[in-house]
Amino acid sequence: WELTILHTNDVHSRLEQTSEDSSKCVNASRCMGGVARLFTKVQQIRRAEPNVLLLDAGDQYQGTIWFTVYKGAEVAHFMNALRYDAMALGNHEFDNGVEGLIEPLLKEAKFPILSANIKAKGPLASQISGLYLPYKVLPVGDEVVGIVGYTSKETPFLSNPGTNLVFEDEITALQPEVDKLKTLNVNKIIALGHSGFEMDKLIAQKVRGVDVVVGGHSNTFLYTGNPPSKEVPAGKYPFIVTSDDGRKVPVVQAYAFGKYLGYLKIEFDERGNVISSHGNPILLNSSIPEDPSIKADINKWRIKLDNYSTQELGKTIVYLDGSSQSCRFRECNMGNLICDAMINNNLRHTDEMFWNHVSMCILNGGGIRSPIDERNNGTITWENLAAVLPFGGTFDLVQLKGSTLKKAFEHSVHRYGQSTGEFLQVGGIHVVYDLSRKPGDRVVKLDVLCTKCRVPSYDPLKMDEVYKVILPNFLANGGDGFQMIKDELLRHDSGDQDINVVSTYISKMKVIYPAVEGRIKFS
């Protein structure tokens, strides 16, 4: 019996087609992805093949103005239109709190939404009961397939699930649910979830009875043969893991942002064992037509976005200096504003010992592309912020050793004075440079704000300590020459859309007046 699994993950509100790098589509003839194009390909495959499941491994939420405006209603609407069969909860599905998940998505989705390792307690338990499930048994042709979900247990540090959801260890939570499916005579089981490729492989190895793992969170690109675009494969598709009980378990993921549609064909024997598996992600490039009816619907929903872009988010009573002349040479108040917003967006008081789990922010000055003039009645709009942060990036959470941070700050000024983008703006960090010293030895003082303290204060950076830092995904990926970050980071979790972070902060503060306050000094 053959099953075709079509899968997406980490779509991050890319409802419209995007450029090749998943930013805003500029030249339509070169654009990719989007739900209208995805629908065309899904329909084609459904038409051709008998037993097809369309699955999503989480993080539909967060990433473009679509989510900012529609807050998840767009996800439910267009996933319903594409007739998804199941979805796993990702960490970003909790970005607007549990209510922001329940109302727009859980109550509106016409497909099951799954996670076996999230347990509700207190008053939430009855409110959310039945709105998401640990597993679902789906009829496919003449057979049944069990889908069991899972979500990163780091979600409380990455999003806003509140205090009434407990995120358990994935493997511990999955095993009893898979066992239950086996007792229900379901012998074909897919684990669908959002914990990253390493955890996907562990689930394949450790959870008895799981036949296939469809994952997300780590934006992993797997491919067999010559890859069709810029993404470099982390391994073959599917990636085969030998389980502890000796089975060959295919593990798949389909990069991110709706650029590819994962396509996996599995052949099962009559006892539900995987006999063979093959496939590849399908690049959704512009040679695949956008479905006209879905496209028309997208255009209808778009109207509200255009109106939103020009509405006031808040006010500034000071000039927001985002000029290259400032942000690439010294501390600039636009850099301070953005870093303060980044920290504010990551406030998660999850432990009595810590006032917060993260206190530090770094931001490449070259990523700040425009100032905002306060003389326009102080008004700040989404449109203004899009000029400051035009690249459609995210502000991510990483874990780094102190020694890596020290290297990063040396790199920040290794060729100072040439208006290059690697000069770092900061939050929760005090740095002093001596430019008379040779490159690689210019950081004379580097103090960082404590987290394990009731009264935050600045202490000298410890080389061997592991620190959490918020930074642009551009830096996490080694951009602007920060190869040491990419090479030495110990953990990397994708965060929220950059403009969304700053706009939320400005809306919350209502009136802002960031200052230049001595975060960066030269001796």
């Epitope: 065309t40 038409r47 051709a48 490039n285 040679s287 006209p292």
Partner: antibody, heavy 121, light 107 residues
Framework: QVQLVQSGAEVKKPGASVKVSCKAS????????LSWVRQATGQGLEWMGE????????YYNEKFKGRVTMTANTSISTAYMELSSLRSEDTAVYYC??????????????WGAGTTVTVSS | AIRMTQSPSSFSASTGDRVTITCKAS??????VAWYQQKPGKAPKLLIY???YRYSGVPSRFSGSGSGTDFTLTISCLQSEDFATYYC?????????FGGGTKLEIK
Amino acid sequence: QVQLVQSGAEVKKPGASVKVSCKASGYTFTSYGLSWVRQATGQGLEWMGEIYPGSGNTYYNEKFKGRVTMTANTSISTAYMELSSLRSEDTAVYYCARYDYLGSSYGFDYWGAGTTVTVSS
Amino acid sequence: AIRMTQSPSSFSASTGDRVTITCKASQDVSTAVAWYQQKPGKAPKLLIYSASYRYSGVPSRFSGSGSGTDFTLTISCLQSEDFATYYCQQHYNTPYTFGGGTKLEIK
């Protein structure tokens, strides 16, 4: 290399049936769709229907529903098109053409050489 | 069924000429349009798929454009081997339909 080899010319009487074959080689037969297109002498092209050999799923042009049957034998990588209740206006060249539904070439990328079917009393 | 109206139905041109053939769909077909070349007694050959993508091995003088309902095939510098009949086809909805053809003849 990809090849679609069709069966030879047929002469049929009105009311009879004809079965045209299309043998595929050079690719995985079950991973592509096969369409049948006909062309009457001096006329344009007319799509009759398609079969997906991997699943056996068929889709027919309403115009031929009830008269056309498309099948595939995956063990010998051959597709068949049977047209019944033949009439003189069915006299045409019948082509099989491949369709890459997993790829991105929206069109028929390989065609058979055609089979001439003549319906005459 | 979606109607594909092709024009002109025939056209006389000389080698070296730039030739444009148009095709109009009776409803929005996105970019799901292909163009074929057919010579007498031969099967059609795919030239352009998805409205603007040149099929492998097709000379660069052939180009396609359009989306929605209006499509164009352009031959930038006509060669002697290009005299043939050209068909557009929509691949958006079944029944897949072809234009009536454009016969390109030597002037």
